[in-house]
């Protein structure tokens, strides 16, 4: 037995990490990263905060919560099967061994293939870079993602055809959004 | 298996001292926080504070401040709580559990009871 | 400290129903809200953390749902054996804090 935290190949993947700030907007230092904590600070470090700010990060890592309340949570941004190990959350309280050290252990699993509707098919077929998954935990949401590349008058297809299919129905009903832009 | 053994039940004179025993078995001690928890019939749980096994490091709910002092023994693999100036108000069951925000594995309880 | 209401302090409902127990927050929590089940006589087990995430080996009727300061635990087919009182408990703070507990009966 042992809690594990899980994500399929494409999602967002969460990490939970929290700690009770001393007083509102005193922070400590976070940092995250891959590998097991060591004795000080973090081993390949994925993202770090400061007393004030995030401070550094790399891509497809970033902090959805309000770090300033003490949410440290991490979001892994499309996970592939690679994202899976061990992650390290520390906060690095001041004085001497003062730091948390949390362990968490991510386990990515390869995508189902579910069969689609024709008409949602034809639709990620026309538009095959929309369709992304966003959010985490069992009941997962989708969301259509930002548009590159797309021109105005696809815009204006894409519309149409949302308004006329399934799809529309299905995204409204799980609180979908489109992002232009 | 993981396992977190409790003695089941300490009977205490008011004014006295208990020392509660949590004994883990079946995973590494000192990779998971211990937590205590206490339980009154109708009132629910409460969270009394918790150790880091590893670096001895503390944190308790104000409320239990004075009155539990956490503690572990690393090669025994066992950790602590102790009860000091016993009242009836201290008459619950204690649970260990372990992991760092919430608690996957529970003690098996202790009962204690505070009379004269 | 944050206070976790559970509102229902008592629920009864049929085998094979299915029931959602609520619990709200005195704060924003995120989704940072575990729920327990407690059997009589037994301690209490870990089934849902995270808000949504099932742990190791709990059946698939458990759910939990919900982020911000509301929060939901759903048993989606009743069975005689989930007769028990189930705790939320908000693992975003310090002092950590648990609902009252809600018991579940089984008609």
């Known amino acids: 037995s042992e809690v594990e935290y899980r994500a399929e190949v494409g999602q967002n993947a969460y990490l939970p990490c929290f700690y009770t700030p001393a007083a509102p907007g005193n922070l400590v230092p976070v940092c995250w990263g891959k590998g097991a904590c060591p004795v000080f600070e973090c081993g390949n470090v994925v993202l770090r905060t400061d007393e004030r700010d995030v401070n550094y990060w790399t891509s497809r890592y970033w902090l959805n919560g309000d770090f300033r309340k003490g949410d440290v949570s991490l979001t892994i941004e499309n996970v592939t099967l690679a994202d899976s190990g061990i992650y390290c959350c520390r906060i690095q309280i001041p004085g001497i061994m003062n730091d948390e050290k949390f362990n968490l252990k991510l386990v990515i699993k390869p995508a189902k293939v579910t069969p689609a509707p024709t008409r949602q098919r034809d639709f990620t077929a026309a538009f095959p870079r929309m369709l992304t998954t966003r959010g985490h935990g069992p009941a997962e949401t989708q969301t259509l993602g930002s548009l590159p590349d797309i021109n105005l008058t696809q815009i204006s297809t894409l519309a149409n055809e949302l308004r006329d299919s399934r799809l529309a129905n299905d995204l409204r009903d799980s609180g979908a959004t489109i992002r232009i832009g | 298996q993981v396992q977190l053994q409790q003695p089941g039940a300490e009977f205490v004179k008011p004014g006295a001292s208990v020392k509660l025993s949590c004994k883990a078995s079946g995973y590494t001690f000192t990779s998971y926080w211990m937590h205590w928890m206490k339980q009154r019939p109708g009132r629910g749980l409460e969270w009394i504070g918790r150790?880091?096994?590893?670096?001895?490091?503390?944190k308790y709910n104000e409320k239990f401040k004075n009155k539990a002092t956490l503690t572990v023994d690393k090669p025994s693999s066992t950790a602590y709580m102790q009860l000091s100036s016993l009242t009836s108000e201290e008459s619950a069951v204690y649970y260990c559990?372990?992991?760092?925000?919430?608690?996957?594995?529970w003690g098996t309880g202790t009962t204690v009871t505070v009379s004269s | 400290d944050i206070v976790m209401t559970q509102s229902h302090k008592f629920m009864s409902t049929s085998v094979g129903n299915r029931v959602s127990i609520t619990c709200k927050v005195s704060q924003d929590v995120s989704t940072a809200v575990a729920w327990y089940q407690q059997k009589p006589g037994q301690s209490p087990k870990l089934l849902i953390y995270s808000a949504s995430y099932r742990y190791t080996g709990v059946p698939d009727r458990f759910a939990g749902s919900g982020s911000g300061t509301d929060f939901t635990f759903t048993i989606s087919s009743v069975q005689a054996e989930d007769l028990a009182v189930y705790y939320c408990q908000q693992h975003f703070n310090t002092p950590f804090t648990f609902g009252s507990g809600t018991n579940l009966e089984i008609k």
């Open positions: 150790i880091d096994p590893d670096s001895g490091g503390t």
């Open positions: 559990a372990r992991y760092y925000w919430f608690f996957d594995i």
